[in-house]
């Protein structure tokens, strides 16, 4: 009972029930209409047949589909369900009495006025484009602008409320009962999104009569989520009339699938969320609407929310990075596929592996850090887009490097210092993802120290001089030695070597000019001297 491509939804009466089965294809977009049978008499057992609404978004690559209708025909979605089987004649006014009259049905007062959810996430709707080439969500859904269709099995019962008078003629051939004829009837609902109404079409029964009218003339302009009870159905070749109930589904354009994946988790997670737009839950019984979502190849991950439509996030975690997943997201109406979206989602780039750096043979003020080219493991890590190299002694400096370099000369270092180098690889996906930092360390070689600071000379006695100073800003080596050279008239007088800069020079000549030169030696190199001139006094004695 696959309908021809014609934007329709369908229902059937008194269907034979099959065991529940619902194969969800991987990487295929079906156009075969789904169908459901709901058995009457209180049973809610259902039968599924695969089906889908399919519209490829422009940024998606179409999936193979040998059954896709030609461009000339609209995509179809068929919904099949068996409506409830009324067994009693309604009292006059049946289910149609307004409040205050006999037979009134009380309207629940607790139904919220409007529980539609705001659409605040960018919808994966037609003509949208993926935010990032590394995490694209490709939605296939029926182009309901031209209509969608659904098929339901509707149970029938004897038309006890029928207005046809009983026949008094004895026929020589027994007519088939209308209950039997309409017991398996398929009703195709075609959605007209332009005016948001449905047309119902009773399939496989010629010249079906709804009451006194041709059914095809009256089963149109049906409001979504409406419920029509005790419709008298018959045709020329059956008697007596039987009744069916119709449950018109919500418009398929009321549902949209949204990508709710947090950017931070987009490499290992897929989050999808059905949202409703302009779906009036005062009218539409949310208990009739449910959803199923799962993604291949992760067979075990499935989100199911049955019996009530509470738009909530379905997040599948622990997925592989940079992997194509085919996700099947379905909205079920009374247990039947109303909307089925097949979405291709590629998880974001994975965390890259960082190669181990080598710190090389350092000089006093620079060293070469090098690392091997990363071996790409596409199943787990992504090829880096670049590197961040940091080096620190007390403070840290970092440098961003392109992904085509495998070495970097670190310059402007301080001599004779311990440095730690960290290298991390990163990728730019929805966010920048950094690999684990790998480290190496080194010690720069010694270099000439700076000059001593704050050199002072003083004359405690007529023929002695005190010399003091502070350490250099940078000693640049392992040891601390202060060297004092005393000169007079350009000639060497004496030399001192101490580990602190406090020199007492006595027994100098009276009334003589001296030159005092202090330098620092770090055990490897000697620095420049600082010079002070001082004269001894005449001998006061």
């Amino acid at each position: 009972q696959t309908p021809t491509p014609s934007d329709e939804l369908s229902t059937t009466e008194n269907a034979l029930l099959l065991p529940q089965s619902d194969p969800l294809p991987a990487r295929t977009t079906e156009s075969t209409p789904p169908s459901i049978s709901e058995r009457g008499n209180g049973s809610s057992e259902t039968t599924y047949h695969p089906g889908v609404l399919s519209t490829l978004l422009p940024h998606l690559s179409p999936q193979p589909d040998s059954q896709t209708p030609s461009a000339g025909g609209a995509d179809t979605q068929t919904f099949s369900s068996q409506a409830d089987n009324p067994t009693l004649t309604p009292a006059p006014g049946g289910g149609t009495d307004p409040p205050g009259v006999p037979g009134e049905r009380t309207v629940p007062g607790t139904i919220p006025a409007d529980t539609a959810f705001p659409v605040d996430t960018p919808s994966l709707a037609r003509n949208s484009s993926a935010a990032s080439p590394t995490h694209t969500s490709n939605v296939s859904t029926t182009d309901i602008s031209s209509g969608a269709s659904l098929t339901t099995l509707t149970p029938s019962t004897l038309g006890l409320a029928s207005t046809d008078p009983p026949s008094t003629t004895i026929a020589t051939t027994t007519k088939q009962t209308c209950a039997a004829m309409f017991g398996n009837i398929t009703v195709n609902y075609t959605y007209e999104s332009s005016n948001q109404t449905f047309k119902a079409d009773l399939k496989d029964v010629q010249n079906a009569k709804c009451g006194n009218e041709d059914c095809e003339n009256v089963l149109n302009n049906l409001e979504e989520c409406s419920q029509i009870k005790n419709i008298s159905v018959s045709n020329d070749s059956c008697a007596p009339a039987t009744t069916i109930d119709l449950y018109v589904p919500p418009g398929t354009d009321k549902f949209s699938l949204h990508d709710c994946t947090p950017k931070e988790k987009a490499n290992t997670s897929i989050c999808l969320e059905w949202k409703t737009k302009n779906l009036d839950f005062r009218k539409c019984n949310s208990d009739n609407i449910s959803y199923v979502l799962h993604c291949e190849p992760e067979n075990n991950t499935k989100c199911i929310r049955r019996n009530t439509f509470i738009p909530e996030r379905c997040q599948l975690d622990n997925l592989r990075a940079q992997t194509n997943y085919t996700c099947v997201a379905e909205i079920l109406y009374r247990g039947v596929k109303l909307v089925k979206n097949v979405i291709n989602v590629q998880t974001d780039l994975g965390i890259p592996e960082t190669p181990k750096p080598s710190c090389g043979d350092p000089a006093a003020r620079k060293t070469l850090v090098s690392w091997p080219e990363p071996v790409s493991k596409p199943e787990s890590a992504s090829k880096p887009h670049g590197y961040v190299l940091c080096y620190k002694n007390n403070s840290e400096k970092c440098k961003s490097l392109p992904n085509n370099v495998t070495s970097f000369e670190v310059e402007s270092l301080k001599p004779y210092k311990y440095y730690e180098v960290s290298l991390l690889a990163y990728v730019n996906g929805k966010i920048q993802r950094n690999g684990t930092a790998e480290k190496c360390n080194f010690h720069t070689k010694a270099d000439r120290p700076d000059k001593v600071n704050g050199m002072k000379t003083s004359r405690p006695t007529d023929n002695s001089i005190n010399v003091t100073c502070g350490p250099p800003y940078e000693t640049n080596g392992p040891k601390t030695f202060y060297i004092l050279v005393v000169r007079s008239g350009g000639s060497f007088v004496t030399k001192y070597n101490k580990t602190n800069c406090q020199f007492y020079v006595d027994n100098l000549y009276y009334s003589t000019d001296y030159e005092f030169l202090v330098s620092f030696h770090n055990g490897v190199y000697e620095g420049d001297s600082v010079i002070r001139n001082e004269s001894t006094n005449f001998n006061a004695k």
Epitope: P108, I111, E213, C215, N221, L246, K283
Partner: nanobody
């Protein structure tokens, strides 16, 4: 919103016929039940006849005498009343009722048209 305007009421003799019309405008759907109710002084409003997707329902008191029909293209519901009796005298109200799968239903009423059957 749905607006309903009735017409066709009047004063007739017992046994005569009368045809009431109710024109609906606004958000009118074929899935809604349209019908006629009547109320005579001192009584409650009672069902006369309803129709939805071609299927009519009648009160026992009018079966065989009244016929309800609906022109979906024009959104008009008619009540053909034959063999009128004095007890059919009442104000006749047109009703539009949408019933939903949630159990919620919404009613709209016309202003009413007077039918008087007197000999």
């Amino acid at each position: 919103q749905v607006q309903l305007v009735e017409s066709g009421g009047g004063l007739v003799h017992p046994g005569d016929s009368l045809r009431l019309s109710c024109a609906a405008s606004g958000s009118v759907f074929n899935s809604a039940t349209m019908g006629w109710y009547r109320q005579s002084p001192g009584s409650q409003r009672e069902l006369v006849a309803t129709i939805v997707v071609g299927t009519p329902t009648y009160a026992d008191s009018v079966k065989g005498r009244f016929t309800i029909s609906r022109d979906n293209a024009k959104n008009i519901v008619y009540l053909q009343m034959n063999s009128l009796k004095p007890e059919d005298t009442a104000v006749y109200y047109c009703n539009y009722r949408a019933t939903y799968t949630s159990g919620y239903s919404r009613d709209y009423w016309g202003q009413g048209t007077q039918v008087t059957v007197s000999g």
